[in-house]
């Protein structure tokens, strides 16, 4: 066989044995002559250079450029490729020689008592165990241990080639510690040398430092950095570290393998760097490198070393936070410090604790901010080592989009008598107060009778052509009063009123309030009727268990068939045509009520009496009357509110006090409840009677004792009682000083 590229002028060296393969018996002599056109050299198996003693290369006697290779008494190990080549060229001729030695069918490597085969556990990779044969057509199998397994050539992925060795998928022998080839010749077994199986992996999945970031220490503390390398199986790892003062004398490095769960396809290695008594010069970048030989991965972290523990606020710390009701508010405590400070939040001086609505930690989080969250929040940072404290105040301002109080009355609003003067009110609560409140109007029929529009809960009046109240052509004459400000339920509210000079036309009125964070609106149904009129007897909101009468009065000459109904709880109408009020057109939602009819000279009066009114009696009451001539129905609606009975409670400044003789004492006892409670005063459990020195005012709410004497000292009790029970508060009045005896002073007497 020839090897290399033919040269222009040179022929290949010519061998005396013109074969690719030569088979000879052991103990015979091998002799091959090589002739050429320039200086020649021989290469032979095992020892590739000319130092082998048994091999003789001699110049030919009969010519230039000719060399003979001679090996007397060949052995199986002489099997292999014999190459004759021109010096300094690739031009060569090769013959493969088998030395058949049935006692030693495998060629042994000169130096090895055992060999090493490196494999990976890759399913697609094959490995060659180099058990070459001195006989080309042996039956060879591969033995692996432990446990013992035998692999036989299958004509596919498992094969044996005398020139190459035994080829097998590497994963099949990855479990084994060692393998060897075995040949059977005439029932005799011959074994190759042992090959140690070394399974190699190389891939590093990642290198992770722990802590991974934000490492801060102060001088003298201990630094411990862990570096974990995750690798595929059968990988060995070298670790190395790079850091500012690599020559550190207090440095300690520990490398170890970590246990991984059986069945895991991963291996973990850990390297720990420890520096005791860290110094400022140790501040800087720390890098850990892990290397398997074929792959290196690195990771870095910065270590900050402080001179001493400290705490300070960061520059980005806010002083004012603005939010809108319902939003989530996050106020981060931005700090610089080592070690991380303890963080405590206070609101108006009171410590805040975390719960489902508020989380007080590194970040103060208010889940759904409300008005009551407005205030000054103080964050106090405390260094856990030095106990140094730093505080910072953050003002939280919670804005409220305009809310219109009357909006909660979502039932059809009362009807208004034709020709009367009426006042419509919008009471707006907003923070900041609304910068404007505008009124708009629209004729009732324009809005109510458009079935093309769908109605939604958020917009029950889908009217589009709202007109400014300045333009009241075709409507009622209107005047908008200047906004007023009132303290209602402890809140500053803006009240806007619209005065309708004469109720001539049924219309819808809308007030719209706008502030910096939103807008609110209220639509008022202003239904004008020429029909009956409803009055309440007595003319005030009843409390539970009180009696009330609803009177419906109608001109007898115009109306007939007076009937009382109650408007039942109704789902939101589907069609716009049913909105807003003409309840007369939709009697399905009305419950007929029993009532008593009275008459006077001009009117019929239908009285519907509610004895022992309950909260269930609240709602909209409809009086229906029929026009005698046209038979058209006229409806009037009146909303009835029943106040809940509330047991008495007392608020006020009744507290123990010390007074000097001759001075005055003024105390108040404010009671609330429904029905309103009666207030009584007692001294030392006896009823306090008014006289010249003891004055009770404002329904006994305020007690004044003028020019007190020693005998005024005692236990004073304010008691508020109603049918629902009593509430009381007590205070002890101490009178100090000596009593002057004088006839001029005719002092009051109690009891």
């Amino acid at each position: 066989a020839s090897v290399g590229l033919p040269s222009v002028s040179l022929d290949l060296p010519r061998l005396s044995i013109q074969k690719d393969i030569l088979t000879i018996k052991a103990n015979t002599t091998l002799q091959i002559t090589c002739r050429g056109q320039r200086d020649l050299d021989w290469l032979w198996p095992n020892n590739q250079s000319g130092s082998e003693q048994r091999v003789e290369v001699t110049e030919c006697s009969d010519g230039l450029f000719c060399k003979t290779l001679t090996i007397p008494k060949v052995i199986g190990n002489d099997t292999g490729a014999y190459k004759c080549f021109y010096r300094e060229t690739d031009l060569a001729s090769v013959i493969y020689v088998y030395v058949q030695d049935y006692r030693s069918p495998f060629i042994a490597s000169v130096s090895d008592q055992h060999g090493v085969v490196y494999i990976t556990e890759n399913k697609n990779k094959t490995v060659v165990i180099p058990c070459l044969g001195s006989i080309s057509n042996l039956n060879v199998s591969l033995c692996a241990r432990y446990p013992e397994k035998r692999f036989v050539p299958d004509g596919n992925r498992i094969s044996w080639d005398s020139k190459k060795g035994f080829t097998i998928p590497s994963y099949m022998i990855s479990y084994a510690g060692m393998v060897f080839c075995e040949a059977k010749i005439n029932d005799e077994s011959y074994q190759s040398i042992m090959y140690i199986v070394v399974v190699v992996g190389y891939r590093i999945y990642d290198v992770v430092l722990s802590p991974s970031h934000g490492i801060e220490l102060s001088v003298g503390e201990k630094l411990v950095l862990n570096c974990t390398a995750r690798t595929e199986l059968n990988v060995g790892i070298d670790f190395n570290w790079e850091y500012p003062s690599s020559k550190h004398q207090h440095k300690k490095l520990v490398n170890r393998d970590l246990k991984t769960q059986s069945g895991s396809e991963m291996k973990k290695f850990l390297s720990t760097l420890t520096i005791d008594g860290i110094t400022r010069s140790d501040q800087g970048l720390y890098t850990c490198a892990a290397s398997s030989g074929l792959m290196t991965k690195k990771n870095s972290t910065f270590v900050r070393v402080h001179e001493k523990p400290f705490v300070a606020f960061g520059s980005g710390m806010e002083s004012l936070v603005e939010a809108t009701v319902g939003e989530r508010v996050r106020i981060p405590a931005k700090y610089l410090g080592y070690p991380p400070p303890e963080i405590k939040w206070y609101k108006n001086g009171i410590p805040l604790e975390s719960n489902h609505t508020i989380k007080a930690g590194h970040v103060l989080t208010i889940m759904e901010v409300s008005e009551r969250d407005t205030g000054n929040y103080t964050v106090i940072l405390t260094n856990p080592i030095s106990k140094e404290k730093q505080s910072h105040v953050v003002s939280l301002v919670v804005y409220v989009p305009p809310q219109i109080g009357e909006k909660s009355l979502i039932s059809p609003v009362d009807s208004y008598q034709y020709g009367t003067t009426q006042t419509l009110t919008c009471t707006v609560y907003a923070i900041p107060p609304p910068h404007h409140i505008h009124w708009y109007w629209q004729l009732e029929e324009e809005c109510a009778n458009e079935p093309s529009h769908a109605v939604s809960v958020t917009n029950p009046y889908p009217c589009e052509e709202w007109r400014s109240v300045e333009d009241f052509q075709g409507g009622n004459k209107i005047e908008v009063n200047k906004n007023q400000f009132a303290l209602i339920e402890g809140k500053n509210k803006t009240v806007s009123t619209l005065v309708i000079q004469a109720a001539n036309v049924s219309a819808l009125y809308k007030c719209e309030a706008v502030n910096k964070v939103g807008r609110g609106e209220r639509v008022i149904s202003f239904h004008v009727t020429r029909g009956p009129e409803i009055t309440l007897q007595p003319d005030m909101q009843p409390t539970e268990q009180e009696s009330v009468s609803l009177w419906c009065t109608a001109d007898r000459s115009t109306f007939e068939n007076l009937t009382w109904y109650k408007l039942g709880p109704q789902p939101l109408p589907i069609h716009v045509g049913e909105l807003p009020t003409p309840v007369c057109k939709n009697l399905d939602t009305l419950w007929k009520l029993n009532a008593t009819m009275f008459s006077n000279s001009t009117n019929d009066i239908l009285i519907m009496e509610l004895k022992n009114a309950s909260l269930q009696d609240q709602g909209d009451y409809v009086c229906l009357a029929q026009d005698r001539k046209t038979k058209k129905r006229h409806c009037v609606v009146r909303q009835l509110t029943v106040l809940e009975r509330v047991a008495p409670t007392i608020t006020g400044n009744l507290e123990n006090q010390t007074t000097s003789i001759g001075e005055s004492i003024e105390v108040s006892c404010t009671a609330s409840g429904n029905p309103p409670p009666q207030i009584m005063w007692f001294k030392d459990n006896e009823t306090l009677v008014e006289d010249s020195g003891i004055v009770l005012k404002d329904g006994n709410r305020n007690l004044t004792i003028r020019r007190v004497r020693k005998e005024d000292e005692g236990l004073y009790t304010c008691q508020a009682c109603s049918v629902l029970g009593c509430a009381k508060v007590e205070a002890f009045f101490i009178i100090e000083g000596a009593q002057e005896k004088t006839n001029l002073e005719h002092h009051h007497h109690h009891h």
Epitope: A290, L294, T296, K297
Partner: antibody, heavy 117, light 112 residues
């Protein structure tokens, strides 16, 4: 600036030995895996051997296994390739390369080895 | 070993035009970590190889964005848009999914 400078190449007879060196500068040598890659005249690049950062783990191409030894001296910032039993087919330009994440991100200019009698 | 085949062997181009070099692997280079371990190198005349692209499509630092890598598990492409005179040389692809790491036969880019 990262620099890798190979040396030690030359002409050697078949069966002979030679040691190549690669002097590294401009980076922390002990934090990178190192490799030798060769290129025979007119042939493709061929990976030869690799070594881990501490020198504990080495890998070789089948064609050089048992004949070549890769080593490193981190104190001297130097990589070595000891080549024994050299063959004509080992004739090539030998490059040393820096490795990170398996990638050869910097290479030396190369040193030429010729194996010939 | 994984065999890497590159086409074409030679690629004459005019400066300013765009070219593509193909590389095919005898086995998928998509590893179980979801990354494709294929690199591209450029060896300029008389110089050592320079890493251009790693993990199939990530440009090495300092490599102009005219160079882009793409591909699937076994078929890969290096695209050079607007070829410049300094881009001449031999382009090699290399697989890193399985040891021993092997290189493609190279594609010689030359100016017409």
């Amino acid at each position: 600036e990262v620099q890798l400078v190979e040396s030690g190449g030359g002409l050697v007879k078949p069966g002979g030995s030679l040691r190549l060196s690669c002097a590294a500068s401009g980076f922390t040598f002990s934090m990178y895996g190192m490799s030798w890659v060769r290129q025979a005249p007119g042939k493709r690049l061929e990976w030869v051997a690799s070594i881990s950062i501490g020198g504990s783990y080495t890998y070789y191409a089948d064609s050089v296994k048992g004949r070549f030894t890769i080593s490193r001296d981190n104190a001297k910032n130097t990589l070595y390739l000891q080549m024994n039993s050299l063959r004509a087919e080992d004739t090539a330009v030998y490059y040393c390369a820096r490795e990170l994440d398996g990638n050869y991100d910097y290479w030396g200019q190369g040193t030429t080895l010729t194996v010939s009698s | 070993d994984i065999v890497i085949t590159q086409t074409p062997l030679s690629l004459p181009v005019t400066p300013g035009e765009s070219v593509s070099i193909s590389c095919r692997s005898s086995k998928s280079l998509l590893y179980k970590d979801g990354k494709t371990y294929l690199n591209w190198f450029l060896q300029r005349p008389g110089q050592s190889p320079q890493l251009l692209i790693y993990l199939m499509s990530t440009r090495a630092s300092g490599v102009p964005d005219r160079f882009s890598g793409s591909g699937s598990g076994t078929d890969f492409t290096l695209k050079i848009s607007r070829v410049e005179a300094e881009d001449v040389g031999v382009y090699y692809c290399q697989q890193l999914v399985e040891y021993p790491f092997t290189f493609g036969s190279g594609t010689k880019l030359e100016i017409k």
